[in-house]
Interface confidence: low
């Protein structure tokens, strides 16, 4: 049976996947679906990894973790009762039949008291530029095979993780307020 | 095998108007961010203009904000750039290179062999 | 704009050197640094990203580092065909910038 995974309402869901790639930067794509998952990839889609980088996500999925060091979790933003159900996470390691595969559960509660209005970054309409959030290592060289640690206490907000300014004076016009969870 | 094909360069008069393309094969441009990198002779490189074809986000280099217009049509997997009231310090090699869409990771890793545009009277 | 401040500008070296360039931010960039090797009348080839990422079919005699806003190349064994103008570029914001270039020559 599936591993079950609870939000409420409004907050962010988060669903862990994880492998080890054979070297840090070697990457295996991965891919994230709403269903169970099939035999070969991943139906309906939500986001996809290649052997390099995130290609391809839709609005509000989007990965939090480090995943050149092979976290791929999922974080769900906003959430609403028809996230419930079950993702599939491949992680596509190269052969016949070699896929790794797991299915999660997801139950999303409604919400004890109303949510405060949250910003929901739509990658592929509203900004579809920005980081994923990411927690920064240490500024101190960087080796080939040799990433800092991420410390996931502190894993920076989005609003330090805008990558345009442009975006971010955009919003401190606005009047708009970033809440991360 | 990822290619990337620029056409459109050429000679044009100051205050002229030229649109380049950029056909892209072996990949969907709506999964990458495609830019336009220019460099005028012996000079170095200029990023101008890229586009997020998912969203159609855009973004430009002041230089030509206002005068240049990039786009892409996603079902010929195709990039423009409109270059309007060209300048001769418009005048370089014309590249557009494929980026990817989480801009921390936004390096160019692939390259069309370039377009020259040469803006003179 | 963020400037990226490559240096030398030129280098003269012979085969089985060790060549290091290095590039300066002039503000956080994060991890977000590219390198590129441009040969004349080519586009530029990508050989690292992510500061110190190896591209695939790169040869590992090319490495990257960064120590805060300073960003490192270097070429471990100098090969005839590593003879060159090298770039770097930051991503971290808008617009991404690219230092002004260095041109490796044959001593």
């Known amino acids: 049976s599936e591993v079950e995974y609870r939000a409420e309402v409004g907050q962010n869901a988060y669903l862990p996947c994880f492998y080890t790639p054979a070297a840090p930067g070697n990457l295996v794509p991965v891919c994230w679906g709403k269903g169970a998952c099939p035999v070969f990839e991943c139906g309906n889609v939500v986001l996809r990894t290649d052997e390099r980088d995130v290609n391809y996500w839709t609005s509000r999925y989007w990965l939090n973790g480090d995943f050149r060091k092979g976290d791929v979790s999922l974080t769900i933003e906003n959430v609403i009762l028809a996230d419930s159900g079950i993702y599939c996470c491949r992680i596509q390691i190269p052969g016949i039949m070699n896929d790794e595969k797991f299915n999660l559960k997801l139950v999303i509660k409604p919400a004890k008291v109303t949510p405060a209005p949250t910003l929901q970054r739509d990658f592929t309409a509203a900004f579809p530029r920005m980081l994923t959030t990411r927690g920064h290592g240490p500024a101190e060289t960087q080796t080939l095979g040799s990433l800092p640690d991420i410390n996931l206490t502190q894993i920076s907000t989005l609003a330090n993780e805008l990558r345009d300014s442009r975006l971010a004076n955009d919003l401190r016009d606005s009047g708009a307020t970033i809440r991360i969870g | 095998e990822v290619q990337l094909v620029e056409s459109g360069g050429g000679l044009v008069q100051p205050g002229g108007s030229l649109r380049l393309s950029c056909a892209a094969s072996g990949f969907n441009i709506r999964s990458y961010a495609i830019h336009w990198v220019r460099q005028a002779p012996g000079k170095g490189l200029e990023w101008v203009a890229d586009i997020t074809p998912a969203g159609g986000d855009t973004e430009y280099a002041d230089s030509v904000k206002g005068r240049f217009t990039i786009s892409a049509d996603t079902s010929k997997n195709t990039a423009y750039l409109q270059m309007n009231s060209l300048r001769a310090e418009d005048t370089a090699v014309y590249y557009c290179?494929?980026?990817?869409?989480?801009?921390?990771?936004?390096?160019?890793?692939?390259w069309g062999q370039g377009t020259l545009v040469t803006v003179s009277s | 704009d963020i400037q990226m401040t490559q240096s030398p500008s030129s280098l003269s070296a012979s085969v089985g050197d060790r060549v290091t360039i290095t590039c300066r931010a002039s503000q956080d960039v994060n991890t977000a640094v590219a390198w590129y090797q441009q040969k004349p009348g080519k586009a530029p080839k990508l050989l690292i990203y992510s500061a110190s990422f190896l591209y695939s079919g790169v040869p590992s005699r090319f490495s990257g580092s960064r120590s805060g806003t300073d960003f490192t190349l270097t070429i471990s064994s100098l090969q005839p065909e590593d003879f060159a103008t090298y770039y770097c570029?930051?991503?971290?914001?808008?617009?991404?910038?690219f230092g002004q270039g260095t041109k490796v020559e044959i001593k």
């Open positions: 570029q930051q991503h971290y914001t808008t617009p991404p910038t």
């Open positions: 290179a494929r980026g990817y869409i989480y801009r921390m990771w936004d390096s160019y890793d692939y």
